[in-house]
Interface confidence: medium
């Protein structure tokens, strides 16, 4: 029960996290114009990874894409790359984890295979979360060090949104979404890795308990293992059928709910 719950919860948490990473990557509010000390007449400006937007004082909003790759700051390119890598890894991780879920039966897939897949997806989620956190943090650092302002003139060729009046930029909503989403993906990945340990079939060595019966000796092996003849045998036992006493978490499973931000 505990293993399935951990795995299922890890999957759901990661799913929400990856949806959040996708949302953050697509959002335009990575950096927003600081509204403190801002005139009523000024246009409110905010920028994302892909385009820059202005909201006029009348309420009309217009966005223009960055129609160049070479003119963009290297740091912005790096943030884009980190977020995309995070999304790709997360998406692959989700795909792998779906097949790894205990509640989903695929043919005669063994628990060891599911455990490996759970571990793989868990690692992918951890790396995905770290990529998102790193990307958002790099961008936040750019804002803090006024890097964004120093490259504002580069956006002239990306729709011509020229900014010659000094404007302060602050953290946009996308940064917080990215941090939370990255954290959730990371937590989900850790949960998957924890679940993996519970899924892996333990290869336990059982000490034979000898019974002296008339005629021949039998070493009795308990719980779902075939008894083998031979007195005091200490050989490794192979599970040959699935009909032994099941643990609670092998019997019960909970379906995962899919969510999208």
């Amino acid at each position: 029960m505990a293993v399935t719950a951990c795995q299922g919860l890890g999957f759901v948490v990661s799913l929400i996290g990856i949806a959040g990473i996708i949302a953050a990557t697509c959002m335009d509010q990575w950096s927003t114009q600081d509204l403190y000390n801002n005139p009523v007449t000024a246009v409110f400006n905010y920028q994302g990874l892909w385009r820059s937007c202005v909201r006029e004082s009348s309420g009309f909003t217009e966005c223009r894409g960055y129609f160049t790759l070479l003119g963009l700051p290297a740091m912005l390119q790096a943030v884009r790359a980190l977020m995309i890598v995070g999304i790709v890894l997360g998406a692959i991780g989700l795909l792998v984890s779906i097949f790894a879920l205990k509640c989903i039966r695929i043919g005669s897939m063994e628990d060891s295979a599911k455990a490996n897949m759970t571990l793989t997806s868990g690692i992918m989620f951890i790396v995905s979360g770290l990529c998102a956190i790193a990307g958002v943090s790099v961008f936040a650092n750019m804002l803090v060090t006024n890097f964004w302002m120093s490259t504002a003139n580069m956006y002239t060729g990306m729709g011509g949104m020229v900014q010659t009046v000094q404007t302060r930029y602050t953290f946009g909503a996308a940064l917080f979404v990215g941090w939370v989403a990255g954290g959730l993906t990371l937590i989900g990945g850790v949960m998957m890795c924890i679940a993996c340990r519970g899924l892996a079939p333990e290869e336990t060595n059982y000490k034979a308990v000898s019974y002296h019966a008339s005629g021949h000796s039998v070493a009795y092996k308990p719980g779902g293992f075939k008894a083998s003849t031979g007195f005091g045998s200490n050989t490794k036992n192979k599970k040959i059928y699935d009909g032994g006493a099941r643990t609670e978490d092998e019997v019960q499973s909970y379906p995962s709910k899919h969510d999208y931000v």
């Epitope: 007449t41 006029e56 009348s58 009309f60 217009e62 729709g159 011509g160 020229v162 009046v165 404007t167």
Partner: antibody
């Protein structure tokens, strides 16, 4: 080089109409807010109307709202001011001005002005 | 509406003088103020924006200061070409307003 050239001024009777034009060159016209400012003979500067870069947001001085209409054609790099129901107090030199940025209405470039005279 | 009051409205000075021009706003406008110079028969020219930022190409003898309601344009070493009319303008809120102007003449 940034250039703003106004035209369309002239003599008009009270109650009449006039359309001023401002041809812009030397900058990405659609990326800047544009403004009309007037100056009555021997008087100070008076803000008339402003228009955002997109052309979607318009702003007018109270005394001109409803009578004047500001517009722009970004494909022609031209700013317009349609003036209706003109009064004697509208007599002034009308300047077309470019905003310093998309975001603030400081005027870094001005046209040479066009004189509008409203008299009977 | 925000009223801008310039003082003095008329100023007589000599070449080399340090000339201060004051602009008072009827309410706080932070630093959203510009200064323009206008010579007879010409269009105004932007000297300073954001209360203290010198516009490119403008000589460094022009400087702006102040915040809130009180602003000053200072010409540190008055030159013959500086004899003109100076206007302040606020961009804090609509309607945009200009001061009445300060005419600087040769003594």
């Amino acid at each position: 080089e940034v250039q703003l050239l106004e035209s369309g001024g002239g003599l008009v009777q009270p109650g009449g109409s006039l359309r001023l034009s401002c041809a812009a060159s030397g900058f990405t016209f659609s990326s800047f807010a544009m403004t009309w400012v007037r100056q009555a003979p021997g008087k100070g500067l008076e803000w008339v109307s402003s228009l955002s870069g997109s052309g979607r947001s318009t702003y007018y001085a109270a005394s001109m709202k409803g009578r004047f209409t500001i517009s722009r054609d970004n494909s022609k790099n031209t700013l317009y001011l349609q003036m209706n129901s003109l009064r004697a107090e509208d007599t002034a030199i009308y300047y077309c001005a470019k905003s310093l940025s998309y975001y603030h209405y400081y005027f870094d470039y001005w046209g040479q002005g066009t004189l509008v005279t409203v008299t009977s | 509406d925000i009223q801008l009051t310039q003082s003095p409205s008329f100023l007589s000075a000599s070449v080399g003088d340090r000339v201060p021009i004051t602009c008072r706003a009827s309410q706080g406008i932070s630093n959203f103020l510009a200064w323009y110079q206008q010579k007879p028969g010409k269009a105004p020219e932007l000297l300073i924006h954001s209360a203290s930022t010198l516009q490119s190409g403008v000589p460094s003898r022009f400087s702006g200061s102040g915040s809130g309601t009180e602003f000053t344009l200072t010409i540190s070493n008055l030159q013959p070409q500086d004899f003109a009319t100076y206007y302040c303008q606020q961009v804090n809120s609509y309607p945009l307003t200009f001061g009445g102007g300060t005419k600087v003449e040769i003594k």
